[in-house]
Amino acid sequence: SPVPPSTALKELIEELVNITQNQKAPLCNGSMVWSINLTAGVYCAALESLINVSGCSAIEKTQRMLNGFCPHKVSAGQFSSLRVRDTKIEVAQFVKDLLVHLKKLFREGQFN
């Protein structure tokens, strides 16, 4: 049966915690991704940014989980208007920023 949205968000948060906790070397070899606007459509925007990182097993589960939250198909090279123009950050920082934002969404009951 489908997982309740609150449970799915909690699981995504815990996965991001695991990523930030378990990194010994730079996450995804220090790969850079587009920074995103966290105020709306965060799941699809985050997926659009992270999907351009390939060969990084540490974030594969996160990519799959974000895919479950995003209602449309996302493919590499696709950029929404939610991207912060010409600003790239390391995946590790991207994940930290995303984690804090998702914890706030959980607090506010915004599970979808």
Epitope: K10, E14, V17, V100, K103, K104, R107, E108
Partner: antibody, heavy 122, light 108 residues
Framework: QMQLVESGGGVVQPGRSLRLSCAAS????????MHWVRQAPGKGLEWVAV????????HYADSVKGRFTITRDNSKNTLNLQMNSLRAEDTAVYYC???????????????WGQGTMVTVSS | SYVLTQPPSVSVAPGETATITCGGN??????VHWYQQKPGQAPVLVIY???DRPARIPERFSGSNSGNTATLTISRVEAGDEADYYC???????????FGGGTKLTVL
């Protein structure tokens, strides 16, 4: 300015009751979750109870559940804590605290009263 | 219920950096808040939502939260920073607010 003022503290015998009140001013009281936090002499902070901004939900620490009741009157900007069956371990400074209200009351406490002392002793 | 563990005391010389930790099972999944309390006074919020700082709090105060440990860092410590510091989270599972035991910061 924004203010929380507690009252009702004092010395009470074990097993008796006491009612604390908190008068809020300078902000939209009805839009905030309100908490009680206590601090025993020389000890750390202990959360006691919360009431949602509209009074629709209340939650309590296990140590006071079934004995304490938190209520609010949004028309009078007041918060109350009815304390029954008091024990010696309830002796503490009791703080009235404000927290912005979300779906869950995970917000930080951004305004504290100065506290009122409750002493439970025979 | 959820338990937060803080060291009872931390000592630091003026001008140095103080690090106060708050341990909890997967605390990185929670939003952590920090309070400063000076003797005879009510606590004051110094960091909220892991990393954010209220307007009146100096930039010397910063927070982080990852894995099983949240951290309050005070850089260029001053004598006036001497106080008790408490971490706090909301436990979603039990609908209760939880405080750490507190850390007494002593400025040598």
């Amino acid at each position: 300015q924004m203010q929380l003022v507690e009252s009702g503290g004092g010395v009470v015998q074990p097993g008796r009751s006491l009612r604390l009140s908190c008068a809020a001013s300078g902000f939209a009281f009805r839009t905030y979750g309100m908490h009680w936090v206590r601090q025993a002499p020389g000890k750390g902070l202990e959360w006691v109870a919360v009431i949602w901004y509209d009074g629709s939900a209340t939650h309590y620490a296990d140590s006071v559940k079934g004995r304490f009741t938190i209520t609010r009157d949004n028309s009078k900007n007041t918060l109350n804590l009815q304390m029954n069956s008091l024990r010696a371990e309830d002796t503490a400074v009791y703080y009235c605290v404000r927290a912005p209200q979300w779906y869950l009351s995970a917000e930080a406490f951004d305004l504290w009263g100065q506290g009122t002392m409750v002493t439970v002793s025979s | 219920s959820y338990v937060l563990t803080q060291p009872p005391s931390v000592s630091v010389a003026p001008g140095e950096t103080a690090t106060i930790t708050c341990g909890g099972n997967l605390i990185g999944a929670y939003l952590v808040h920090w309070y400063q309390q000076k003797p005879g006074q009510a606590p004051v919020l110094v960091i909220y939502d892991d990393v954010d700082r209220p307007a009146r709090i100096p930039e010397r105060f910063s927070g982080s939260n990852s894995g099983n440990t949240a951290t309050l860092t005070i850089s260029r410590v001053e004598a006036g920073d001497e106080a008790d510091y408490y971490c706090q989270v909301w436990d979603h599972d039990t609908n209760t607010m939880v405080f750490g035991g507190g850390t007494k910061l002593t400025v040598l």
